[in-house]
Interface confidence: medium
């Protein structure tokens, strides 16, 4: 089961779509590449600057709120899903 961590204060950084292992998987940073992009789909910050934001979870971009948040793996919580519950 997965929990969406409610962020009231923003987290912040680069996070790619999913980190599912127990150990944080860090993607290469540096933003998006690909020059001459025309008619691009709307950019998802989770694929660029917030690529590594969610330590044990999945980055979610809520476009109408212009917000990036984390959907934590089971047993993890916190803005960046970096804290493990003791249960």
């Amino acid at each position: 089961s997965v929990r969406v961590e409610q962020v009231v204060k923003p987290p912040q950084n680069k996070t790619e779509s999913e980190n599912t292992s127990d150990k944080p998987k860090r993607k290469k940073k540096g933003g998006k590449n690909g020059k001459n992009r025309r008619n691009r789909k709307k950019k998802n910050p989770c694929n660029a600057e917030f690529q590594n934001f969610c330590i044990h979870g999945e980055c979610k971009y809520i476009e109408h709120l212009e917000a990036v948040t984390c959907k934590c793996q089971q047993e993890y919580f916190g803005e960046r899903c970096g804290e493990k519950s003791m249960k």
């Epitope: 923003p10 950084n13 917030f50 590594n52 934001f53 960046r80």
Partner: antibody, heavy 119, light 107 residues
């Protein structure tokens, strides 16, 4: 209250290095990227790069690769920028800025650190 | 890198005037654009993000519009405290890039 407090003005000789700091308080340091921007006297703003304080991962504008090194000390909630091989063109005010994320925009800035490079 | 061309570089206006500043990106930036105000000796302050969203606490006389490559900051009725330099910033793609700035001076 969120605060970003930068170190004081520096005067350096050409070829020297300088390390300026940005100490934060009032929020969880590792939850927000720290950005660095510079402004030469009478000129516009220039984006240098950013660092993720949790991992210590930096990202740089191509222009500043090899010139700026961004680091953090999580224990003191401080971000650092070291500038190497200083030249007169590096004379500028350097700002740190926090990027909020809910929504994500630059919501807090340091007061700026003036670095003067002069022989 | 994405180039941001801001115009005019300076303008003179009077209190009560409507002021418009434009920024043109060298490619589509998907409305990932902020506007900043900077006063002498001070750090920049964000006014607008995502092209048209007003930061909390910023007076409603400031507004942003635009999409694709072309963006505008409008001050509907200039106030004495609005005399400053304004910058746009694209944050669609690394490295983020600023426009050259527009200095708004008293006529």
């Amino acid at each position: 209250e969120v605060q970003l407090v930068q170190s004081g003005a520096e005067v350096k000789k050409p070829g020297a290095s300088v390390k300026i700091s940005c100490k934060v308080s009032g929020y969880a340091f590792t939850n927000y990227n720290m950005y660095w921007v510079r402004q030469a006297p009478g000129k516009g703003l220039e984006w240098i790069g950013y660092i993720d304080p949790y991992y210590g991962d930096p990202g740089y504008s191509q222009k500043f690769k090899g010139k700026a090194t961004l680091t953090v000390d999580k224990s003191t909630s401080t971000a650092y920028m070291e500038l190497s091989s200083l030249r007169s063109e590096d004379t500028a005010v350097y700002y740190c800025a926090r990027r909020g994320n809910f929504p994500y925009y630059f919501d807090y800035w340091g007061q700026g650190t003036l670095v003067t490079v002069s022989s | 890198d994405i180039q941001m061309t801001q115009s005019p570089s300076s303008l003179s206006a009077s209190v009560g005037d409507r002021v418009t500043i434009t920024c043109k990106a060298s490619q589509d930036i998907n409305s990932y654009l902020s506007w900043f105000q900077q006063k002498p000796g001070k750090a920049p302050k964000t006014l607008i993000y995502r092209a048209n969203r007003l930061v909390d606490g910023v007076p409603s006389r400031f507004s942003g519009s635009g999409s694709g490559q072309d963006y505008t900051l409008t001050i509907s009725s200039l106030q004495p405290e609005d005399f400053a330099t304004y910058y746009c910033l694209q944050y669609d793609e690394f490295p983020y890039t600023f426009g050259g700035g527009t200095k708004v001076e008293i006529k």
